[in-house]
């Protein structure tokens, strides 16, 4: 029962997380114009992964897509790639986990198969969550670097007395949505992996062998460390799931400098 609950909860948490990752990827507010300590303008700028928008005080909003592919900064492309990979892995993980759910019966699917599918989907959710968190963090790092660069020369002189204001950008709502969604997907994936351990019953493929010593009637049942309990006539095959050391180390390094505005 606890295993089913853990698996179901993991699925739901991951589902919410992946929906959040998709929402964050589509949102326009990845970076928003910094209003603190800035001259009050009647125009509000904000940018997403796919387009930049301008909202005028009058009520009009105009958005322009980034129609170039090669002309975009490498870091922005990297963030896009990470988010898309996260979405794809998450979607596949959801598909796999639906069939792996203990509460859903599909033909004569064995518990071992369900356990493997649960583990697979769990790993996919973990990687998906990490991709989203990495993507959002790379973008946030880009913003922080650009913020301090533009603060250093916020007012650039243009021919003597004339001043032009450089727009500074800060964290948009999409970043927070992305971080939370990535975290939820990650947690959901961990829950799926935990559920996987308890999904299948233990397994022993050792048949009982009786050694008849002279004058004695003692039955020896060699079963190693995974011997069945007691010395009764239990000859049923029990499946063993060895939830041993399965590790996935993903080391990703990103440049710390960028030129995206």
């Amino acid at each position: 029962m606890a295993v089913t609950a853990c698996q179901g909860l993991g699925f739901v948490v991951s589902l919410i997380g992946i929906a959040g990752i998709i929402a964050a990827t589509c949102m326009d507010q990845w970076s928003t114009q910094d209003l603190y300590n800035n001259p009050v303008t009647a125009v509000f700028n904000y940018q997403g992964l796919w387009r930049s928008c301008v909202r005028e005080s009058s009520g009009f909003t105009e958005c322009r897509g980034y129609f170039t592919l090669l002309g975009l900064p490498a870091m922005l492309q990297a963030v896009r790639a990470l988010m898309i990979v996260g979405i794809v892995l998450g979607a596949i993980g959801l598909l796999v986990s639906i069939f792996a759910l203990k509460c859903i019966r599909i033909g004569s699917m064995e518990d071992s198969a369900k356990a493997n599918m649960t583990l697979t989907s769990g790993i996919m959710f973990i990687v998906s969550g990490l991709c989203a968190i990495a993507g959002v963090s790379v973008f946030a790092n880009m913003l922080v670097t650009n913020f301090w660069m533009s603060t250093a020369n916020m007012y650039t002189g243009m021919g003597g007395m004339v001043q032009t204001v450089q727009t500074r950008y800060t964290f948009g709502a999409a970043l927070f949505v992305g971080w939370v969604a990535g975290g939820l997907t990650l947690i959901g994936g961990v829950m799926m992996c935990i559920a996987c351990r308890g999904l299948a019953p233990e397994e022993t493929n050792y048949k009982a062998v009786s050694y008849h010593a002279s004058g004695h009637s003692v039955a020896y049942k060699p079963g190693g460390f995974k011997a069945s309990t007691g010395f009764g006539s239990n000859t049923k095959n029990k499946k063993i799931y060895d939830g041993g050391a399965r590790t996935e180390d993903e080391v990703q390094s990103y440049p710390s400098k960028h030129d995206y505005v």
Epitope: V40, T41, A42, V43, S52, S58, Q163, T164
Partner: antibody, heavy 117, light 113 residues
């Protein structure tokens, strides 16, 4: 079609308050901003302030202490209140709708206000 | 506050002539987000409310004759009226629509001979 009409008292005594109503038609106050602009006799235009679709307001820095702009979306009315009037506040007061580029694309005909005892 | 300086303060032209009105702002009105200049031009004929001519420094309002052309970027802007007509007798104002408070220039009075 879009129309704006100001209605004011005409004559106001010094130190009193001025209240002007701008009644609009042809557009929604929840979507578009309305600006207030005044023009003293024989002089140029002066922007007083604006109320935007979301209800937020911006005022001219020189008038912020004595100017308030409100609206009633259901009645399609915008209200300007200017307190502690002086002779220099004598002007024609216009309300104008905001359009693209925050430009004022439709104007009322204006209401003339004289501050005199 | 942003200071808008218009020049000349007045000029007299004959019909059919081409005229250029200048406007200078104390700060750049160019928005980096959409690369548009938030400068507006208005025409005010005697005894009438102002009328919108040009917004975003160069976009002509619908119904405005083609002889009115706005140009410029950053801090320097011009309104060009080619083939001036008798009905163009008016005062022309430029306005900053970028920084609060919105500010108007002192106006250029166009007179016809």
């Amino acid at each position: 079609q879009v129309q704006l009409k100001e209605s004011g008292p005409g004559l106001v005594a010094p130190s009193q308050s001025l209240s002007i109503t701008c009644t609009v038609s042809g557009f929604s106050l929840t979507k578009f901003g309305v600006n207030w602009v005044r023009q003293p006799p024989g002089k140029g235009l002066e922007w007083l302030g604006a109320i935007w679709g979301d209800g937020s307001t911006n005022y001219h820095s020189a008038l912020i202490s004595r100017l308030s702009i409100n609206k009633d979306n259901s009645k399609s009315q915008v209200f300007l209140k200017l307190s502690s009037l002086q002779n220099v506040d004598t002007a024609t007061y216009y309300c104008a709708k905001s359009g693209y580029g925050n430009a004022m694309d439709y104007w009322g005909h204006g209401t003339s206000v004289t501050v005199s005892s | 506050d942003i200071v808008m300086t218009q020049s000349p303060s007045s000029l007299t032209v004959t019909t059919g002539e081409k005229v250029t009105l200048n406007c200078k702002s104390s700060q750049s009105l160019l928005n980096s987000g959409n690369l548009k200049n938030y400068l507006t031009w208005y025409q005010q004929r005697p005894g009438q409310p102002p009328k919108l001519l040009i917004y975003w420094a160069s976009t002509r309002e619908s119904g405005v004759p083609y002889r009115f052309t706005g140009s410029g970027s950053g801090t320097d802007f011009t309104l060009t009226i080619s083939n001036v007509q008798a009905e163009d007798l008016a005062i022309y104002y430029c306005q900053n629509d970028y920084f609060f408070p919105f500010t108007f220039g002192s106006g250029t009075k166009l007179e016809i001979k």
